[in-house]
């Protein structure tokens, strides 16, 4: 989290952001909030982002003026306008590109003064794994896909039985690029599975974290996965 | 690659008038801000006015508020300066500029307006 | 109206001499917007620095900015025969536009 205050000259603002990450080819949201003001005409956001000459965006007098947007920004960036007026300057970012990465400040001009904030955006590929059990194979084999990873992340196995257990001497990881030749698919196998344990395929870069959980018992397999986001910090 | 082209610049006797124009080229120029700036011989850079992309905001400097008029045709690529009431001190280099984050990041090569009688 | 004071107003400097240029403002200057052209005898104006430290495309590594509130200044690292030029700082933070009254830089 990062909160910021205003300059001097008026009174200054507070304004927070929040670090985050973009996953390549999706929207994504810039996080930014301020103290509201009760008239939306006296409110100006400026999005601005290090190295770039052009405002990310930039909305005034209640709506979004553009004139002086950067190129690369061009028909992809909106603010929530109808939360402006209780203090919500996020930014939503659409198609996030590799190139979106890098360091915004969230700049906001009220009747009660001003205020800015700087958040780090980070953009990468991170996607769910699904762990299925490899019938093909010819032990117990699992096998562990997710679709679109970048950068290229670190695969870990574990086992709730076996805990600390190291599986790499039994497993195999590849990575195939993906047709936009940026994102890459993770497959990730496991040898000599045994039964009624509960096995997790760990895949981590340092955007993201996922994990698939599957638990092979002889009447049933259970499966679960779920995805964090590093370094989500508040400014 | 971004091109910037004034022209009607000449001669022109105090009180009277002329109207310049600006040819831009190699980006959008409807999804962009603009600027005239001028230059007196010899003297410094001064800022004369701003149109938006869809002429809805339009800022004049206080030396030429009521006397020029800043505008526009996105369908022709044009910027245009109607300067009316002329005077010695306008005599200057004429540029226009393309403002990019409250920055002028392309110039065009200037036309000279000359007052004089 | 934001008022941009440049000093020195001229300088002459050795190749090689590293040169500082300096603009103040009579007021703050919001969101950075601070920017620095550089016009060579005969040319048009170039954007050369823009939000107080950022190089436009093309100008080299030579060139920095730095500056926050109302004090800005441009280094020239070690000079060179073609910076021979006159440098403008301009704020784009309020209406109206202003520019510093610029410094000629000469070559010694």
């Known amino acids: 989290l990062i909160i910021g205050f205003g300059i001097s000259g008026r009174h200054s603002i507070t304004v927070t952001t929040v670090a985050s990450a973009g996953n390549i080819g999706e929207d994504g949201i810039l996080s930014c909030t301020f103290e509201p003001d009760i008239k939306l005409s006296d409110i100006v956001i400026q999005w601005l982002k290090e190295g770039v000459l052009g405002l990310v965006h930039e909305f005034k007098e209640g709506k979004d003026e553009l004139s002086e947007q950067d190129e690369m920004f061009r028909g992809r960036t909106a603010v929530f306008a109808d939360q402006v007026i209780v203090g919500n300057a996020s930014l939503r970012l659409k198609n996030v590109q590799l190139t979106d990465a890098g360091t915004y400040k969230c700049y906001i001009i009220t009747s009660k003064g001003k205020g800015n904030a700087n958040l780090e955006y980070k953009t990468g590929a991170f996607s769910m794994p699904e762990v299925n059990v490899d019938y093909n194979a010819s032990s117990e084999t699992l096998r562990c896909e997710a679709p679109r990873w970048f950068p290229q992340p670190t695969v870990v196995w574990a086992s709730q039985v076996d805990q600390g257990a190291n599986f790499s001497e039994v497993s195999n990881t590849s990575f195939e690029l993906n047709s936009e030749n940026v994102t890459m698919k993770v497959v990730s196998v496991l040898y000599n599975v045994t039964i009624n344990n509960t096995y997790s395929c760990m895949i981590e870069n340092d955007i993201a974290k996922a994990t698939g959980d599957i638990k092979v018992t002889e009447s049933e397999i259970k499966r679960r996965s779920h995805l964090q986001l590093l370094n989500s910090k508040a400014s | 690659e971004v091109q910037l082209v004034e022209s009607g610049g000449g001669l022109v006797k105090p009180g009277g008038s002329l109207k310049l124009s600006c040819a831009a080229s190699g980006f959008t120029f409807s999804d962009s801000g603009m600027h005239w700036v001028r230059q007196a011989p010899e003297k410094g850079l001064e800022w004369i006015t701003y149109?938006?992309?869809?002429?809805?905001?339009?800022y004049y400097a206080d030396s030429v508020k009521g006397r020029f008029t800043i505008s526009r045709d996105n369908a022709k690529n044009t910027l245009f300066l109607q300067m009316t009431s002329l005077r010695s001190e306008d005599t200057a280099m004429y540029y226009c500029?393309?403002?990019?984050?409250?920055?002028?990041?392309?110039w065009g090569q200037g036309t000279s307006v000359t007052v004089s009688s | 109206e934001i008022v941009l004071t440049q000093s020195p107003t001229t300088m002459a400097a050795s190749p090689g001499e590293k040169i500082t240029i300096f603009c103040s403002a009579s007021s703050s200057i919001s969101s950075d917007f601070l920017h620095w052209y550089q016009q060579k005898p005969g040319f048009s104006p170039k954007l050369l620095i823009y939000r107080i430290s950022n190089l436009a495309s093309g100008v080299p590594a030579r060139f920095s900015g730095s500056g926050s509130g109302t004090s800005y200044s441009l280094t020239i690292g070690t000079m060179e025969a073609e910076d021979v030029a006159t440098y403008y700082c301009q704020q784009g933070s309020n209406v109206p536009r202003t520019f510093g009254g610029g410094t000629k830089l000469e070559i010694k």
């Open positions: 149109i938006n992309s869809g002429s809805s905001t339009i």
């Open positions: 500029a393309r403002g990019r984050g409250y920055a002028m990041d392309y």
